[in-house]
Interface confidence: low
């Protein structure tokens, strides 16, 4: 009987003979078993027990070099070799052709647009430092302690001030290079800039000159003021600010030419610096004339505040604006400085947050918009800058006037709050390509509704459906309004609703979509070739 033993290939040592001279059936009896199948990288070697049997086996040491060459040169082998070589090259060329066809036919990845930092998320305005911080603590050092909060909102820029020295209506006592000592020192400002940079928050400085006075631009001394602004731009750019805001430009004579000049200074320093202009105007033609002469200017206005809060009218305003501005970058807000609650009833705040974060452009908010801060609910507080409600002690004037759900503290505890919705939307806005720079297509969904798609190339797509009405509505999504590149699927997953109660992540049939009063839905669906 022969005994099968398994030998690891690494342990098999070949003897000193050249490979072609090694005996295939040596007298020692170490013969390769023809039946010895390979198993897990091991070779079965049959050890012959009967030496006589092994010795009797004929010795064969393979072909000599001359014999091998003679056989290899025979017509049969030559033909076989040529056939194999031809097959190899045909196979190779076939694979190459296949690869070329696949590459040529595959849809091109769309080239990403140049993205400036203000394209990547929201801006947050703090026009009144003291109101923002409360408890009479409104200074730059205190604001530094609130940067963590701004980080948690995932906003990209802080629009600060004005904080410069300004004696009401007195040009001589207005110094755009000096920080009002009530707000702190230049050192405090530098320290704030450093901390903000570490948290990836850009700082935009408001340089509206006569912010405490009647006319923001001292209407009679425009040239003097314009020179002051030019000097201030250069000074603060050197100090490290990321941009500037000037408001009430409808009160500035020759605003377009001044803005063009200031834009040149700002962009001349770095393309990464931003100029924001604000106007109280809601007139599209006036807005467009300001934009026409200033490439890259971000303009905040009261344009959307005229929407009358109906779906059709809002859709019409948005689409008109986007069509008129072409492919230039927009900003979205309801005013140049005021809170959303100045224009909207409480039940529409969530809807507008969802809309502002998902329209193509930069959403711009005022401090307090994220919690629905409402001056009207705080007796004695100024409409334009009510105290920020951090917690229930933020408004000690009238005990019990502030309940937990009105405050940052209370809303932070509640995943269903307006603040939590703001944080979620801000997070999505800053990381999803379709929301960052995707195409926009509005389409019909029925009366009272405003719906649109955001999509970028082969990335995940987003569908927004907004019910501005105070009755529940069925959405009849008219996909026929959409180009082929933005077609609707039968189902889309619910990313979030502005109302509680829907199961997030669940697929919704778009043909049977029903929205609650004042409900907004953000749905997502994959690209399909």
């Amino acid at each position: 009987m022969s005994q099968d033993t398994e030998v690891d290939m690494k342990e098999v040592e070949l003897n000193e003979l050249e490979p072609e001279k090694q005996p295939m059936n040596a007298a020692s009896g170490a013969a390769m078993s023809l039946a010895g199948a390979e198993k897990n990288g091991l070779v079965k070697i049959k050890v012959a027990e009967d030496e006589a049997e092994a010795a009797a086996a004929a010795k064969f040491t393979g072909l000599s070099k001359e014999e091998l060459l003679k056989v290899a040169g025979s017509p049969g082998w030559v033909r076989t070799r040529w056939a194999l070589l031809l097959l190899f090259w045909l196979g190779w060329l076939g694979m190459l052709a296949g690869a070329v066809v696949i590459i040529v036919r595959a849809p091109r990845c769309r080239e990403l647009p140049a993205q400036k930092w203000w394209h990547t998320g929201a801006l947050y305005r703090i026009g009144d430092l003291q109101a923002f911080q409360g408890h009479g603590a409104g200074n730059l050092a205190g604001l530094k302690g609130r940067l963590d909060y701004l980080s948690s909102l995932k906003v990209k820029g802080l629009v600060l001030g004005p904080i410069h020295k300004n004696q009401k209506d007195d040009v001589a006592q207005t110094d755009l290079l000096q920080i009002d000592p009530n707000f702190g020192s230049k050192e405090d400002f530098d320290s704030l800039l450093q901390s903000a940079k570490k948290k990836s928050i850009r700082v935009i400085l408001d340089l509206t000159p006569n912010y405490r006075g009647e006319n923001s631009w001292f209407s009679t001394q425009v040239d003097t003021v314009a020179t002051k602004v030019k000097d201030a731009l250069e000074f603060w750019l050197q100090a490290g600010v990321d941009g500037f805001q000037v408001r009430d430009i409808e009160n500035l004579k020759d605003a377009s030419s001044f803005l063009a000049e200031w834009q040149n200074i700002t962009k001349g320093f770095s393309e990464d610096r931003l100029l924001i202009a604000g106007t109280n105007s809601s007139d599209l033609q006036q807005i467009l004339s300001l934009l026409e002469s200033n490439k890259d200017l971000l303009l905040t206005s009261s344009y959307l505040s005229d929407s009358g809060s109906t779906g059709e009218h809002t859709k019409s305003l948005v689409t008109q604006y986007l069509n008129a501005t072409g492919n230039r970058w927009c900003s979205w807000s309801l005013s140049q400085a005021r809170l959303l609650t100045s224009f909207l009833p409480a039940q529409l705040l969530r809807l507008y947050q969802l809309m502002l974060f998902t329209l193509p452009g930069t959403p711009v908010f005022s401090y307090g918009d994220e919690i629905g801060l409402d001056a009207a609910a705080l007796p004695g507080q100024p409409m334009e800058a009510p105290v920020m409600l951090w917690d229930e002690s933020s408004f000690p004037d009238i005990p019990g006037a502030v309940s937990a759900n009105m405050t940052v503290k209370g809303q932070s505890e509640d995943p269903g709050s307006l603040l939590s919705l703001f944080r979620r939307l801000s997070d999505q806005r800053s990381k999803e390509r379709s929301l960052l720079h995707g195409d926009f297509h509005a389409f019909s969904a029925g009366p009272g509704l405003f719906s649109y798609i955001r999509h970028w190339d082969q990335n995940e797509r987003f569908l927004v459906v907004l019910n501005f009405g105070d009755v529940g509505l069925s959405a009849g999504l008219q996909a026929s309004d959409l180009p082929a590149s933005a077609s609707l699927p039968a189902k889309a997953d619910l990313l979030l609703s502005t109302q509680p109660g829907r199961e997030e992540g669940s697929p919704l049939e778009l043909e049977r979509l029903k929205l609650e009063p004042h409900e907004g839905l953000l749905l997502r669906f994959p690209y399909a070739a």
């Epitope: 963590d148 909060y149 948690s152 917690d391 229930e392 309940s403 937990a404 759900n405 940052v408 503290k409 209370g410 932070s412 505890e413 509640d414 995943p415 269903g416 939590s420 944080r423 979620r424 997070d427 999505q428 990313l495 979030l496 509680p500 997030e504 992540g505």
Partner: antibody
Framework: EVQLQESGPSLVKPSQTLSLTCSVT????????WNWIRKFPGNKLEYMGY???????YYNPSLKGRVSITRDTSKNQYYLQLNSVTTEDTATYYC?????????????WGQGTLVTVSA | QIVLTQSPAIMSASPGEKVTISCSAS?????MYWLQQKPGSSPKPWIY???ILASGVPARFSGSGSGTSYSLTISSMEAEDAATYYC?????????FGAGTKLELK
Amino acid sequence: EVQLQESGPSLVKPSQTLSLTCSVTGDSITSGYWNWIRKFPGNKLEYMGYISYSGSTYYNPSLKGRVSITRDTSKNQYYLQLNSVTTEDTATYYCQRHVIYDYTWFAYWGQGTLVTVSA
Amino acid sequence: QIVLTQSPAIMSASPGEKVTISCSASSSVGYMYWLQQKPGSSPKPWIYRTSILASGVPARFSGSGSGTSYSLTISSMEAEDAATYYCQQYQSYPLTFGAGTKLELK
């Protein structure tokens, strides 16, 4: 210091109603969110719902309308009712209060009460 | 609802060993929260806002992650760390928990 204490029967028959009370000391239930959470024998935790400072409620949809959370502000207590119980509802029930505020997180839990559903 | 999947379900580690527990969310969450529970006790807040240690938590613990993928790490296992750890999200209602990771001492 905030303390929460659950109380109620430890044995409930199938199809009956499970009722638990959470007594709160050191904080007022008219502030914040007051939750019920349960832990099944296999260690799985399930959020059941809350009653808020204003009395508004939220219930986990998985409980299919069987759950109700109420409160009595004068006693500083809030309550859980779970109808039509089955053996699947056997769990340790916790009342809990969480506070999340910027860079703060507190979660106060009761010690838990084991409720067995059995005939 | 957001489903949190924790792994491993059970693990054992020797004193001094590095331990990592993972938690994966079915959709993106802004932050992850971690609880520690020992037999006979209620769960305790352990790590919040993904990486901030709750009061009294030893510095050998750390948390990291973003989007849908988060983890809790113990740089050097100690006997008192043996417990069940749960991840939890506060992103949206219903609040949800991972199934827990039971960490035992080898």
